[in-house]
């Protein structure tokens, strides 16, 4: 089997209206607190130069960064959504743990590094922005994986 055959999420993960709603409500709450509307983390730049078949691996990297470096530090905010969404995203992350790609992932690492640097440069407002884009993270995982 090709290595990226492990880069799959069951459709059922995205077919639970309650958790979809909570994820998107969390994104909305955070985006209302985000006043830096010119910067987009999950957008054209993130996918540039990355083949569609490798985008699930890309989004796995973004998901893990979001969980560890964004949602955990902000875990006391945006309740009650946060306490429901974090376990859901953690479950998706664990499903993707065997996901790897063969060959050159230089573009992927560059794009993920740029995203991380943008969040870190913006500080707390970068973390809020990343939470405000959880709807994009969700949709990108659904489409790519």
């Amino acid at each position: 089997l090709p290595i990226n055959s492990q880069c799959k999420l069951e459709a059922a993960n995205f077919q639970q209206p309650y958790i979809v709603n909570r994820t998107f409500m969390l994104a909305k709450e955070a985006s209302l607190a985000d006043n830096n509307t010119d910067v987009r983390l999950i957008g054209e730049e993130l996918f540039r130069g990355v083949k569609a078949k490798d985008q699930c691996y890309l989004m796995k990297q973004v998901l893990n960064f979001t969980l560890e470096d964004v949602l955990l530090p902000q875990s006391d905010r945006f309740q009650p959504y946060m306490q429901e969404v974090v376990p859901f995203l953690t479950k998706l992350s664990s499903h993707l743990s065997p996901c790897h790609i063969s060959g050159d992932d230089q573009n992927i690492q560059k794009n993920v590094r740029q995203l991380k640097e943008t969040v870190q440069k913006l500080g707390e407002s970068g973390e809020i922005k990343a939470i405000g884009e959880l709807d994009l993270l969700f949709m990108s995982l659904r489409n790519a994986c």
Partner: antibody
């Protein structure tokens, strides 16, 4: 140059079926999500259906769910829309549309010229 | 089916700025980052002019700009020109993963 060419439209009776095709060229087809959008004569745009890069995720407007099926053949660079149980209100120009960038099919940056479907008795 | 509400028509004189609003329920424009705008001249194919709320595709004039506040997205056309006379549609992804278009706004350039 990105090109999308729709075909398969025509006149069909209520309750009948049609299969629309969209031939894509000028880009790596399997890197992009694709959509069907329709426009009834003199009316606004209505999204019909969308599919992700590998056909694993398919979504439909409520008005066509259960009657229409979207599919793609990446080996043939083609997108399809199987339309069953057609109604008069399905009469429209049907456009094939590609996502503006890979990873976001909902931003429809490239459109075909459309193929006309007329449902009439 | 969710609905995005746009004014049916907006007009302005050459050189003026106009803004077209696109309002949805909290499950539509307000909850998502997926808003796009399309221009369609009579008898022509739609053209993407704004994506991802406020990004402009290459080749689209910088007189077009997009923004979003709460449940309302907006398209602003500054320095209005005769060729801007057209129909404009907003669109957004919604919670059942479908895409919804607004009803369209006819822009008229006066004089």
């Amino acid at each position: 140059e990105v090109q999308l060419v729709e075909s398969g439209g025509g006149v069909v009776r209520p309750g009948g079926s049609l299969r629309l095709s969209c031939a894509a060229s000028g880009f790596t087809f399997d890197d992009y999500g694709m959509n069907w959008v329709r426009q009834a004569p003199g009316k606004g745009l209505e999204w019909v259906s969308g599919v992700n890069w590998n056909g694993g995720t398919r979504d439909y407007a409520a008005s066509v769910k259960g009657r229409f099926t979207i599919s793609r053949d990446n080996a043939k660079n083609s997108l399809y829309l199987q339309m069953n149980s057609l109604r008069a209100e399905d009469t429209a120009l049907y456009y094939c549309a590609r996502g503006w960038y890979s990873g976001a099919a909902w931003n429809m940056g490239y459109w075909g010229r459309g193929t006309l479907v007329t449902v009439s008795s | 089916q969710a609905v995005l509400t746009q004014p049916s028509s907006v007009s302005g004189s050459p050189g003026q700025s106009i803004t077209i609003s696109c309002t949805g329920a909290s499950g539509d424009v307000g909850a998502y980052n997926f808003v796009s705008w399309y221009q369609q001249h009579p008898g022509k194919t739609p053209k993407l002019i704004i994506y991802d709320v406020n990004k402009r595709p290459s080749g689209v004039s910088n007189r077009f700009s997009g923004s979003k506040s709460g449940n309302t997205a907006s398209l602003t056309i500054s320095g209005l020109q005769a060729e801007d006379e057209s129909d404009y549609y907003c669109a957004s992804l919604v919670s059942d993963f479908s895409v919804v278009f607004g009803g369209g706004t006819k822009v008229t350039v006066l004089g």
